[in-house]
Interface confidence: low
């Protein structure tokens, strides 16, 4: 894509000129010593408060004034007298300043030659003080000549810039780092024989101006409009320039509030947030028991999420963060909260066995639930004859010994485990005592 | 309380292998980072290897880059540093550590088991 | 990689005086630094982060400024439990990086 002067839509933004470097065809005694107004070194680009406003620093158009090599402006005095006395066209037009005009149909640059006269050129070749079809990268010499002036002429030697085509502006900006930087570069997108030595590149954002091919702006507001002009020098002679109004991306959103998040059941939790002030698209909710980690997308709009389906008796971590789609995504910070769901009913405990270990004893064993859902642990071992409880013993382990029975007696055995909240089913075994042996 | 248990230092010959072993307790062991760091005797601190919650970002020293390798496994709450090629310079105090929730410093480390490479 | 140094190596102080331990950093690791204590024979123990956020439960004597390249972590009165050797760690850029220790001792 070519560089546009600017962007379409945005009529109403006006594009300021950069101050330019005097525009000499030939090397002066003195040096250049114009200046920029401006320090990149400490000023900080700011937009103006305000939804997507540009800075005002950016629209401060100003009048370009050409400069002499010296960086004074150029004064013509004159003597007068009886036979005044013609300066030489050498010297009159010692300091002539040319501004380079292209035509990207037939490629050639026409020179205009600043001067307040209609001047004459060597060879006839320049039409109202413009020198046409001059090749890039070529040198032509012209011969300026007056009737106000004496030879010798001014032979002044333009040297043609690359194509204007040759040169693009690119934004490089890094898609992660888009919310609060910009990067501008200067791309050389064909060949050309001019010595690159000669080019100079000039950016100038706000009041910041940068002298580099490639500019970086940093610590920018998110979500706001900056104006750039640039422009390309030959010989410090600008022959191409461009403006770019660039938004930076949305930034990271902030991080919610979250006003409570809590469990009031065994199998349930409810967290509720303020949203972040920054614009975003969804909400992540992540939420973590031990090593187990499970992520939801929520909508926008929510301020509070329902957990359903959760385990007994288990610390939950919730996390909670907006994210945006902008050039990337973007995570804002996570809020977190944490909650312990309500007890339940333990499961019921398994591989229950009852073996005889003498004529009236009885070793019962199992194995613990599989999901206890409480804070405690205890075994209950009550063993029934008939329809009598004849014993009620409760241990720490599900390791039950039970003497003294009755001999050629039916039982029946239930072992269940307690949480200190809530016991769990029985595991229930039918066993008989033999006839005694003696 | 927080605990970390480092294991399976030894006396190894240059080119030999060893696995070192850190178990994890008194912490949700599958949120947080973990590192390896390593001490040679009577030297400084060398970081030697990260890994994120579920092991899809890791990082090395340069200096053992190709000859280790870290990794855990959350069910059960352990971290590991696979080292092949070993070196006399790999001789150290091994140091697992824990990274506080949200800044790349260690708030917990384990006491260290100790690899000798020597011939 | 960005190289740490510690000066000085070592630090005779007496118990009840001042001790500053300096960090310096080859580039800038902005605030991105934490400092740590190592007694003989124990595993280091993390005192300051964000170059001067102190941990909970650590001593307000312990304390830690500086920022970019220059760093200082202060011990205002030292006790017997202080002396041991001190790091300095940067976590700004991979790889992490510690200093080569400052052993404070007594004097």
């Known amino acids: 894509q070519s560089p546009t002067p600017s962007p379409t839509g945005v009529s109403s933004v006006q594009t300021p000129h950069l101050p330019t470097h005097a525009d000499s065809q030939t090397p002066s005694a003195g040096t250049d010593t114009q200046t920029f107004s401006g320090s990149a070194a400490n000023a900080k680009l700011n937009p103006t408060p305000g939804s997507n406003a540009i800075s005002d620093a950016y629209l401060n158009a100003s009048e370009t004034t050409t400069l002499s090599p010296s960086g004074s402006a150029v004064i013509s005095t004159t003597t007068i007298a009886t036979t005044p006395s013609k300066p030489t066209c050498d010297e009159k037009y010692a300091n002539i300043t040319v501004d380079y005009l292209y035509n990207k149909e037939t490629k050639l640059f026409t020179a205009k030659l600043n001067v307040n006269e209609n001047v004459e050129c060597g060879n006839n070749t320049c039409t109202n003080n413009e020198v046409h079809n001059l090749t890039e990268c070529k040198n032509a010499s012209v011969s300026i000549s007056h009737n106000s002036c004496t030879a010798p002429d001014k032979t002044l030697i333009l040297d043609v810039p690359p194509g204007v085509e040759k040169f693009q502006l690119h934004d490089c900006t890094q898609v992660e780092k888009a919310d609060t930087t910009i990067c501008l570069k200067w791309k050389n997108i064909e060949t050309f024989t001019c010595d690159t030595q000669n080019i100079t590149y000039r950016f100038q954002c706000g009041n910041m101006i940068f002298d580099n091919k490639e500019i970086k702006l940093e610590n920018l507001e998110p979500e706001h409009e900056y104006k750039c002009d640039s422009e390309i020098l030959y010989n410090n002679h600008k022959f191409t320039n461009a403006s770019k109004i660039i938004k930076t991306d949305f930034g990271s959103p902030g991080e919610p509030q979250i006003i409570f998040c809590r469990s009031e059941a065994a199998h349930q939790g409810v967290i509720t947030w303020n949203p972040p002030q920054r614009s975003f698209h969804n909400f992540t909710l992540c939420y973590i028991k031990e090593t187990e980690k499970d992520c939801l997308n929520l909508d926008k709009n929510l301020i509070k999420y329902d957990l359903q389906n959760l385990k007994p008796y288990t610390k939950y971590v919730l996390s909670l963060h907006a994210y945006i789609i902008a050039k990337v995504q973007r995570n804002g910070s996570a809020a977190m909260c944490h909650f312990t769901t309500k007890s339940a009913p333990p499961s019921q405990v398994w591989n229950m066995t009852v073996s005889m270990t003498s004529d009236n004893s009885m070793h019962v064993k199992c194995r613990p639930p599989r999901d206890r859902n409480g804070p405690h642990e205890r075994y209950h071992l009550e063993v029934e004859a008939g329809n009598t409880l004849v014993r009620n013993e409760s241990h720490k382990n599900c390791d039950f010994r039970v003497k003294d029975l009755q001999y050629s007696t039916d039982y029946t055995f239930k072992a269940y485990f307690h949480n200190g909240d809530y016991p769990g089913e029985p595991f229930i075994l039918h066993h008989s005592t033999s006839y005694n042996s003696k | 309380q927080v605990q970390l248990v480092e294991s399976g230092g030894d006396l190894v010959k240059p080119g030999g292998s060893l696995r070192l072993s850190c178990a994890a307790s008194g912490f949700s062991f599958s949120g947080y980072y973990l590192s390896w760091i390593r001490q040679a005797p009577g030297k400084g601190l060398e970081w030697v290897s990260y890994i994120s919650l579920s092991g899809s970002f890791i990082k090395y020293a340069d200096s053992v880059k190709g000859r280790f390798t870290i990794s855990r496994d959350n069910a059960k709450k352990t971290l590991h540093l696979q080292m092949n090629s070993l070196r006399a310079e790999d001789t150290a105090v091994y140091y697992c550590?824990?990274?506080?929730?949200?800044?790349?410093?260690?708030?917990?480390w384990g006491q260290g088991t100790l690899v000798t490479v020597s011939s | 990689e960005v190289v740490m140094t510690q000066s000085p190596a070592t630090l005779s102080v007496s118990p009840g005086e001042r001790a500053t331990l300096s960090c310096r950093a080859s580039q800038s690791v902005n605030s991105n630094l934490a400092w740590y204590q190592q007694r003989p024979g124990q595993a280091p123990r993390l005192l300051i982060y964000g170059a001067s956020t102190r941990v909970t439960g650590i001593p307000a004597r312990f304390s830690g400024s500086g920022s970019g390249t220059e760093f200082t972590l202060t011990i205002s009165s030292l006790q017997s439990e202080d002396f041991a050797v001190y790091y300095c760690?940067?976590?700004?850029?991979?790889?992490?990086?510690f200093g080569g220790g400052t052993k404070v001792e007594i004097k």
């Open positions: 550590a824990r990274r506080t929730g949200t800044t790349t410093v260690f708030d917990y």
């Open positions: 760690q940067q976590y700004n850029n991979w790889p992490l990086t």
